[in-house]
Amino acid sequence: RADPCAARPCAHGGRCYAHFSGLVCACAPGYMGARCEFPVHPDGASALPAAPPGLRPGDPQRYL
């Protein structure tokens, strides 16, 4: 069976993991979304998508 991570679906350095129901993107700090496409904007943040100090990595997001 083809590797669902072969197409590199996770953006911004997110790590891809094959899963029985599809795949999972574990987002790098400062990103969120199914494919880590959204920069996290904490309240008061500037337009820069950099992660503020202490922001933990995003929870893995399902991508089905």
Epitope: A11, M32, G33, A34, E37, P39, H41, Q61, R62, Y63
Partner: antibody, heavy 121, light 107 residues
């Protein structure tokens, strides 16, 4: 029944703030992202941002950065969108919408009824 | 930002007509595209996601196709309840963006 119910219409003066609520029911609140989309009179749809109700993380469209805040209350399954420093061009219908299956890939499958915000002096 | 261009912006058709609406993306978005229907005074309704997958409960006369930069929404036989405005939306990258809309009116 899966639904999103929004707060009522608001009339605000320029410079003021507005806070719109969106109460979810009929599904597990923390499993699905919530988007906010607005529509000015006679105009198209404009994406404002997204909130992950599970962790409270947010991502806002660039044009709203610094002026919008999206929050959630998991105890009441409610999401809030506050827009500050209102101007006349913020007059619009504001919608909350659910991102399908905890992601945004599937589009926005459930929408609130909309909240009309009128900004006028 | 990815710009979504819909055409036509206005379409006059009769009941029973086959209607096609086109949406073009300013850069490739794979199949990350959704179509919505909106009637006056109402919230949009999701019709199609992933470019070609019909949302549950949507009549089979609606279909979507395309990948990359060019997409189409087709209504095989227009019904009275289909007169509305249709929007495409790209879900490929931040920020999410919509097309300008296509208003389908009765001829």
């Amino acid at each position: 029944e899966v639904q999103l119910v929004q707060s009522g219409a608001e009339v605000k003066k320029p410079g003021a703030s507005v806070k719109v609520s969106c109460k979810a029911s009929g599904y597990t609140f923390t499993t699905y992202y919530i988007h906010w989309v607005r529509q000015a009179p006679g105009q198209g749809l404009e994406w404002m941002g997204i909130i992950d109700p599970s962790g409270g993380r947010t991502s806002y469209a660039q044009k709203f950065l610094g002026r919008v805040t999206m929050t959630r209350d998991t105890s009441t399954s409610t999401v809030y969108m506050e827009l500050r420093s209102l101007r006349s061009e913020d007059t619009a219908v504001y919608y909350c919408a659910r991102g399908g299956d905890g992601t945004w890939y599937y589009g926005m499958d459930v929408w609130g009824q909309g909240t009309t915000v009128t900004v006028s002096s | 930002d990815i710009v979504m261009t819909q055409s036509p912006s206005f379409l006059s058709a009769s009941v029973g007509d086959r209607v096609t609406i086109t949406c073009r993306a300013s850069q490739g978005i794979s199949n990350y595209l959704a179509w919505y229907q909106q009637k006056p005074g109402k919230a949009p309704k999701l019709l199609i996601y992933a470019a070609s997958t019909l949302q549950s409960g949507v009549p089979s006369r609606f279909s979507g196709s395309g990948s990359g930069t060019e997409f189409t929404l087709t209504i095989s036989s227009l019904q009275p309840e289909d007169f509305a405005t249709y929007y495409c939306q790209q879900l490929n990258s931040y920020p999410l963006t919509f097309g300008g809309g296509t208003k389908v009116e009765i001829k």
